[in-house]
Amino acid sequence: SAPFSFLSNVKYNFMRIIKYEFILNDALNQSIIRANDQYLTAAALHNLDEAVKFDMGAYKSSKDDAKITVILRISKTQLYVTAQDEDQPVLLKEMPEIPKTITGSETNLLFFWETHGTKNYFTSVAHPNLFIATKQDYWVCLAGGPPSITDFQILENQA
């Protein structure tokens, strides 16, 4: 992947929300839950109502990028998943509205969404070699791969 410095002048323009109210489950069938306000973690749930419901917004790059670039928001809130550094927890950032244009350091709000069958991967635009990941007894964070789990199943239409 191109280093972040090459991507920093790329502009991303919001297009539309492409998915509403979906749940993310990792490869161990753990759901992402909101923990202690601004953190996310993964847990095996008896009650899926405890899982976070996300919305996904699509962005178009000024550089003709074949990758699908998305923002992740907790449904019915103004909280957006924000990347930090490797092995650091992702945080929930409150913003008054979905950003119309994202560039520079704000790209920590964006992820490249890739699908391989039922597996979904979210690579940080700010750190293109790092994925949203779950880790045993830790927060949802950015990681390069094992032992963290980087593939997710998207569960839609959970009543």
Partner: antibody
Framework: EIQLVQSGAEVKKPGASVKVSCKAS????????MNWVRQAPGQGLEWMGW????????TYADDFKGRFTFTLDTSTSTAYMELSSLRSEDTAVYYC???????????????WGQGTTVTVSS | DIQMTQSPSSLSASVGDRVTITCRAS??????LNWYQQKPGKTPKLLIY???RLRSGVPSRFSGSGSGTDYTFTISSLQPEDIATYFC?????????FGQGTKLEIK
Amino acid sequence: EIQLVQSGAEVKKPGASVKVSCKASGYTFAHYGMNWVRQAPGQGLEWMGWINTYTGQSTYADDFKGRFTFTLDTSTSTAYMELSSLRSEDTAVYYCARGIYYFGSNYAMDYWGQGTTVTVSS
Amino acid sequence: DIQMTQSPSSLSASVGDRVTITCRASQDISNMLNWYQQKPGKTPKLLIYYTSRLRSGVPSRFSGSGSGTDYTFTISSLQPEDIATYFCQQGKKPPYTFGQGTKLEIK
């Protein structure tokens, strides 16, 4: 089994301080915020605020800023609520309650301690 | 801050009656409304979250509905063990305010 066990009843004189403890068990303490709720005799429930059990950062409702302090001992999964400069109107039952987000957005209090009665009397 | 106005403050009903309590928020709370039951001398217990979702183990005679600013809690057929005070609470944003409570008594 998830449990919140609070310290016993306290009788204090005006001007004194009191520290109520709330020991959690049966879940990962750092994953759920701890709320404090006051109930004066014959009255309703008042949300006092909560403490982030991972960062230790507290949020207080306006009526509970100043004399109230929330703290943690993460090694024993215990939350504390300290109240200084006690007044007669602080006489109440104080509850701790675990906070949970349903769907990641709706905040509720799903497990409660048994309550600690604090009586302030000269 | 979001204010929660609950009514009535008390009500008396007979066993088998349908009982309704209302809760009004000072602004739209997007269905983020929870209901608690507190029996005399006991700790509060979460019954319903997110307007209408029954917590595990809660009898199906309890239900909730509503949207925007107006919400309703219903007991379809009042039982003697339902004698308690019921509180609504908004879960949209802190401070997570409660309604004043509704004390339910048996006629």
